[in-house]
């Protein structure tokens, strides 16, 4: 196997790799730096691994993973050394790393010439108390948003930032806006961006008006 | 209104684990804010220690974070701090606080607002 | 880290007086992240101001904030006896969240 890559997203996580297996099986293993390797997906034809149950676990550590290959009938086949072959994944950490899947506004009111913005606060696969976190439980403040926000008659842009998952702006009487958002973890070196949310504009059914 | 109480021993031991509680009183801990812990060393300015959300994500000093655990329990409406290998260095008044979120600019930044009295903590053998 | 140094480290002034304290950051900080708090002998911080200008609930309109990027003022107008404390300038935007070393205001 070759090309291990990572396809995280609100860490629902998924090892892929080549070639599409002609004779040969997979199996995966996965561990964190300290820990013991896990194996799942056993003797698979697929080429690729969920791996989010493992590594929702625990999102700050650091994950590697491992790719077996085992001919098609013979799964003792091993290498030169005696192992069987594999290959290792590039290093993983969720926290750091897992995409930030596109937001959703959740809903919009105006109440004169304010409008509160609310943004979904979507849910994760991570758990805690048997409970599912959503996105803001677990990262916290470290996890901003953006909003663009622009009157329906032109292009000009304004954008607003906040710590939770609600806006409160100021618009011009009379006028219509669209909104879009942006999730956004300013501490991160990598995937620190969300792609846009769908825009959304006053005058249609997520929105509330209000003297 | 919400009240902050700091709770634990004054007088610890070098290389021991310093634990302070935090009980939050006129409010629910699972309400939105964050909650943090602050020290302030004899004479001296203020300290950041972490804060905790009441999910338990957490942040940390990380001149602090390898000996520094926070953590939350929400059924006592408590948030602890655990500070291990303790020096004379840790030797300072401990203050809990909560975080919460004020309209700024069109959207919404977490300050610290509401502060336990503080306690003082002496590590000395 | 950012750091946040204050000045001047004492301020000597009689109750009446305008006092303007400064606060300069190593680096930019987002007004949004700027906050001020006041501290009395035996007391906690008491938090003042928010967003580098807004003044916190209950707090008297004689203290104002002002300033951008690297370097904020705390303004109190008019000194009134209850004023005389140390006060200290933080950020909250970037982790270590980093208070100013304070300025003390005393009665000259």
């Known amino acids: 196997a070759f090309n291990l890559t990572w396809i995280s997203t609100d860490f629902k996580t998924i090892l892929e790799w080549q070639p599409k297996p002609t004779n040969y099986t997979y199996t995966v293993q996965i561990s964190t730096k300290s820990g013991d390797w896990k194996s799942k997906c056993f003797y698979t034809t697929d080429t690729e691994c969920d791996l989010t149950d493992e590594i929702v676990k625990d999102v700050k550590q650091t994950y590697l993973a491992r790719v077996f290959s085992y001919p098609a009938g013979n799964v003792e086949s091993t290498g030169s050394a005696g192992e069987p072959l594999y290959e290792n994944s590039p290093e993983f950490t969720p926290y750091l790393e897992t995409n930030l899947g596109q937001p959703t506004i959740q809903s919009f009111e105006q109440v004169g010439t304010k409008v509160n913005v609310t943004v979904e606060d979507e849910r994760t696969l991570v758990r805690r108390n048997n409970t599912f976190l959503s996105l803001r439980d677990v990262f916290g403040k470290d996890l901003i948003y953006t909003l663009y926000y622009w009157k329906s008659s032109s292009s000009g842009k304004k954008t607003a930032k906040t710590n939770t998952n609600e806006f409160l702006i100021d618009v011009d009487k009379g006028e219509n806006y669209c909104f879009s958002v942006q999730a956004v973890i300013p501490s991160r070196t990598v995937n620190r961006k969300s792609t846009d949310s769908p825009v959304e504009c006053m005058g249609q059914e997520k929105g509330e008006f209000r003297e | 209104q919400v009240q902050l109480q700091e709770s634990g021993p004054g007088l610890v031991k070098p290389s021991q684990t310093l634990s302070l509680t935090c009980t939050v009183s006129g409010g629910s801990i699972s309400s939105g804010q964050y909650w943090s812990w602050i020290r302030q060393h004899p004479g001296k300015g203020l300290e950041w220690i972490g804060e905790i959300y009441y999910s338990g994500s957490t942040r940390y000093n990380p001149s602090l974070k390898s000996r520094v655990t926070i953590s939350v329990d929400t059924s006592k409406n408590q948030f602890s701090l655990k500070l291990s290998s303790v020096t004379a260095a840790d030797t300072a008044v401990y203050y809990c606080a909560r975080d919460t979120p004020y309209y700024y600019d069109g959207g919404y930044y977490y300050y610290m607002d509401v502060w336990g009295k503080g306690t003082t903590v002496t590590v000395s053998s | 880290e950012i750091v946040l140094t204050q000045s001047p480290g004492t301020l000597s002034l009689s109750p009446g007086e305008r006092a303007t304290l400064s606060c300069r950051a190593s680096q930019s900080v987002s007004s949004s992240y700027l906050a001020w708090y006041q501290q009395k002998p035996g007391q906690a911080p008491r938090l003042l101001i928010y967003?580098?200008?807004s003044r916190a609930t209950g707090i008297p309109d004689r203290f104002s904030g002002s300033g951008s990027g690297t370097d904020f003022t705390l303004t109190i107008s008019r000194l009134e006896p209850e004023d005389f404390a140390v006060y200290y300038c933080q950020q909250v935007g970037v982790v270590p969240y980093t208070f100013g070393g304070g300025t003390k205001v005393e009665i000259k």
């Open positions: 967003g580098a200008s």
